[in-house]
Interface confidence: medium
Amino acid sequence: DIIMRPSCAPGWFYHKSNCYGYFRKLRNWSDAELECQSYGNGAHLASILSLKEASTIAEYISGYQRSQPIWIGLHDPQKRQQWQWIDGAMYLYRSWSGKSMGGNKHCAEMSSNNNFLTWSSNECNKRQHFLCKYRP
């Protein structure tokens, strides 16, 4: 049988068994995560687990804007450079931009500098756009 694509919430986009919502709103990292969770379905700030997933997301976001960074679900809660995905996914795929990750920067964003394909760390209280993800 043909595998049918599950439906996502209105306005969310589907890729490989997941639904993604790009919120063009300004939230700090923890408020963004709370807003993602408020949509139910186990939604969290997005984990990005492969280059294929990163490329699909980057292409989608570039259709809206190319200049503003976007929060994702990667953070360093113990502030010891021990990064983890908020949805519990394994931290295997990495796409850091190579910039220094020092200072008080314990939350990760998709950087606009490389068309959203690479990540940078930033201060978690910055208010930025954000990307949510859930499995329908």
Epitope: A9, P10, G11, W12, G21, Y22, F23, R24, K25, L26, Y39, Y64, Q65
Partner: antibody
Framework: QVQLVQSGAEVKKPGASVKVSCKAA????????LHWLRQVPGQGPEWMGW????????NYGEKFQGRVTMTRDRPSSTAYMEIKSLRVDDTAVYYC????????????WGRGTLVTVSS | FMLTQPHSVSESPGKTVTISCTRS????????VQWYQQRPGSAPTTLIY?????PSGVPDRFSGSIDSSSNSASLTISNLKTEDEADYYC?????????FGTGTKLTVL
């Protein structure tokens, strides 16, 4: 006190141009965005575009591209909006409004400039 | 996209009224919604920004909310006063264009 002071009412003939000014007082004329909107009597506001007061960069609404020019003069803290090839249906109150530097909202509005286009 | 509001609503002083704002396409939650009040002959003033935040000076009788299931935003005014009689506009954004709602005239009977 933060305010935007707009130029006075104008009466123009179809085909003419008009330039409305908006002078900022009480805030730094720097990285903020200044929006221009218009409102036909009895209708809702219609967004025309914005200008970045720092860089001078602009973003025009599709409907107004090619006919509207937004500029700013930093020394005098004044922004300008010019419409060319005026039509009768351009008759409206034109507002400038500052986008808050902190949140995504237009927090300070000018009092409006009535532009009447009539033959 | 369009933001559609009821043309008019009316209610008595002391009561509560809710004005809806339905987005025609895309998810209402993906961009902030603002609400503006406009009295005759005056410029609009901000009542609610970023979905549900009130500027200082706006009474807590005014509140904003978002409902993704109906793809709409709502402005609720409780304990209505005669000075609340005005036009109310919602406003949102699509990445390049700022769009205002069709407007609702509130009459306080």
């Amino acid at each position: 006190q933060v305010q935007l002071v707009q130029s006075g009412a104008e009466v123009k003939k179809p085909g003419a141009s008009v330039k409305v000014s908006c002078k900022a007082a009480g805030f730094r004329f720097s990285g903020d965005y200044l929006h221009w909107l218009r409102q036909v009597p009895g209708q809702g506001p219609e967004w025309m575009g914005w200008i970045n007061l720092s860089s001078g960069g602009t973003n025009y609404g599709e409907k107004f591209q090619g006919r509207v020019t937004m500029t700013r003069d930093r020394p005098s803290s004044t922004a300008y909006m010019e419409i060319k090839s005026l039509r009768v249906d351009d008759t409206a109150v034109y507002y400038c409004a500052r986008e808050s530097p902190v949140v995504e909202a237009m927090d300070v509005w000018g009092r409006g400039t009535l532009v009447t286009v009539s033959s | 996209f369009m933001l559609t509001q009821p043309h008019s609503v009316s209610e008595s002083p002391g009561k509560t009224v809710t004005i809806s704002c339905t987005r025609s396409s895309d998810n209402i939650a993906f961009n902030y919604v603002q609400w503006y009040q406009q009295r005759p002959g005056s410029a609009p003033t901000t009542l609610i920004y970023e979905d549900n935040q009130r500027p200082s000076g706006v009474p807590d009788r005014f509140s904003g909310s978002i409902d993704s299931s109906s793809n709409s935003a709502s402005l609720t005014i409780s304990n209505l006063k005669t000075e609340d009689e005005a036009d109310y506009y919602c406003q949102s954004y699509d990445g390049s264009n700022y769009v205002f709602g069709t407007g609702t005239k509130l009459t306080v009977l």
